[in-house]
Interface confidence: low
């Protein structure tokens, strides 16, 4: 074992190159200087190294930065960021986006793992504000990261960067959010023809006002009852029982299962019992035929 | 360091007023979400009300809306909580909290104890 | 608003156990979940963000796991350091709701 331990005659490294992918894991750790690894990182992501092989390169490191590895070897770490767990990462300062880029690249096409999660948190605390590039570049790899970000966060928010987005990237995002996002999806998507436009529109509709939706009524969209019921109640309420019947067009039978959850329950609350009646449904709960109906915000605006 | 340090708590009969301050250090202020939360006398914890980085969104639960005002002095590296309308179910132990990159609360102040009692 | 259930509400338990606590949301809360640790006389400390994330100077001891409605918080071979009041919160949309918490004692 002791003599394991030394480097072989003329197996010392003088550069990272293909020829240590021929090297044993005892070799590379007793013929690779820590100090010439870091210095060349950048050979290291050319040459096709084994998971065994990458975990010592990544031992010697580890060795070399105690404390964490400095940002010259983090920006060309590539595949041997997959071998980080997010103890190492809490220990980087990553402060330069192209870093963050290079390593997000790593990662591209895979759902948001805990290191890149990690990476994402460092990198944002250590830049101290969340500026239109890093979002730009954190909204391109993960479009769903928007949803993690506050409304003030959100402003920033290039319209351009809501093309990459995808229904299932909105999951996570709350009124608060959809209702920063709502504006710029609608400004992304304004030339395109109506039913394009509600295809891509859709997921952001739980920030949509009345006026847009009464605006969508008329066009067929034919919005089935997930998207509705993601509507906000303050936007549904003032929506005529004729709006919602051309708004959901066949799906408007779903009503009916849905009619004790919001905001279906509040916007019947709303209605006429007479309106209700003409969907033929048997949804319940409207005001009753006869009974005077006050707009109490039209009331206040007068007063 | 990073540092929360909460002031004002005091004794105060229902109906009344008062005003609580967290001085922030250690870490750059203004690129922070913040929070107001609180723990009562029976140790549940709650979140009371939350300002957004540059201080134009604030958020607030049913429970404290309209009673109460969150607000903040970047330059001071200062946050606020203004209290009105003050009832005993507002007894509790206040803290200031920094806001993660989600919705957690990643740091927290020692607490300044509020008592609303006649 | 989406209510936060823990259990057990309280445990005692040795040095060198190891214990799970668990935290139910009252609908699918989708990761947005947070675990926090409160010692006697101190405030609350982040453990755990986005149901799996530790935080910054955690031991290793600690794991998160969950999806969906479901959560736990996992201390391995629990040490002196480790006894005090644990919270789940959610942050699933507002209000942001925490458990009634579980106190962790020793035997």
């Known amino acids: 074992e002791v003599e394991k331990t030394a480097c072989p005659s003329g197996k010392k490294a003088r550069e990272i190159d293909e020829s240590l992918i021929f090297y044993k894991k005892w070799e590379l750790e007793a013929c690779v200087d820590a100090a010439l690894l870091a210095t060349q990182m950048d050979r290291v992501n050319a040459i096709p190294f084994t998971y065994e092989q990458l975990d010592v390169l990544k031992h010697k490191l580890d060795e070399l930065y105690p404390q964490g590895y400095p940002e010259s070897v983090i920006q060309h770490l590539g595949y041997l960021f997959l071998k980080m767990s997010p103890e190492d990462i809490r220990k980087w300062n990553v402060t330069s986006l192209e870093t963050l880029k290079a390593l997000l690249e790593v990662n591209k096409g895979h759902e948001m793992s805990p290191q890149v999660a990690t990476l994402i948190d460092r990198f944002v605390k250590g830049r101290g504000q969340l500026d239109k590039d890093t979002l730009d570049t954190l909204t391109a790899f993960y479009p769903g990261y928007l949803c993690s970000l506050s409304p003030e966060e959100l402003s920033s928010v290039p319209p351009s960067s809501i093309w990459a987005v995808r229904p299932q990237d909105l999951d996570t995002c709350d009124p608060r959010q959809l209702d920063v996002l709502y504006p710029k999806a609608r400004l992304a998507f304004q030339n395109m023809n109506g039913s394009e436009y509600f295809v891509k529109i859709q997921s952001f509709l739980g920030g949509a006002p009345t006026e847009d939706l009464k605006a969508l009524s008329q066009q067929n969209v034919s919005m089935d009852l997930a998207t509705f019921m993601k509507l906000r109640t303050d936007a549904v309420l003032p929506l005529t029982v004729a709006e919602v019947q051309k708004l959901l067009g066949p799906h408007v039978e779903g009503l009916k299962a849905e009619e004790r959850h919001r905001p279906v329950r509040d916007w019947i609350l709303r209605q006429r019992q007479d309106d209700l009646d003409t969907l033929g449904l048997g949804l319940q709960g409207g005001i009753p035929n006869g009974y005077l109906v006050l707009d109490l915000s039209m009331q206040e605006a007068l007063s | 360091e990073l540092q929360l340090v909460e002031s004002g708590g005091d004794l105060v009969k229902p109906g009344g007023s008062l005003k609580l301050s967290c001085a922030a250090s250690?870490?750059?202020?203004?690129?922070?979400?913040m929070s107001w939360l609180r723990q009562t006398p029976d140790k549940r914890l709650e979140w009371v009300a939350t300002i957004s980085s540059g201080g134009r969104y604030t958020y607030y639960p049913d429970s404290v809306k309209g009673r109460f005002t969150i607000s903040r002095d970047n330059a001071k590296n200062t946050l606020y909580l203004q209290m009105s309308s003050l009832k005993s179910e507002d007894t509790a132990m206040y803290y200031c909290?920094?806001?993660?990159?989600?919705?957690?609360?990643?740091?927290w102040g020692q607490g300044t104890t509020l008592t609303v009692s006649s | 608003d989406i209510q936060m259930t823990q259990s057990p509400a309280s445990l005692s338990i040795s040095v060198g156990e190891t214990v799970t606590i668990t935290c139910r949301a009252s609908?699918?809360?989708?990761?947005?979940l947070a675990w926090y640790q409160q010692k006697q006389g101190k405030s609350p400390q982040l453990l755990v963000y986005a149901a799996t994330n530790l935080a910054d100077g955690v031991p290793s001891r600690f794991s998160g796991s969950g999806s969906g409605s479901q959560y736990s918080l996992k201390i391995n071979s629990l040490q002196s350091e480790d006894f005090g009041t644990y919270y789940c919160?959610?942050?699933?949309?507002?209000?942001?709701?925490f458990g009634g918490g579980t106190k962790l004692d020793i035997k």
């Open positions: 919160q959610h942050f699933w949309g507002t209000p942001w709701t």
């Open positions: 250690g870490f750059t202020f203004s690129s922070n979400g």
């Open positions: 909290a920094r806001r993660g990159i989600y919705d957690y609360f990643d740091c």
């Open positions: 609908e699918n809360i989708h990761s947005s």
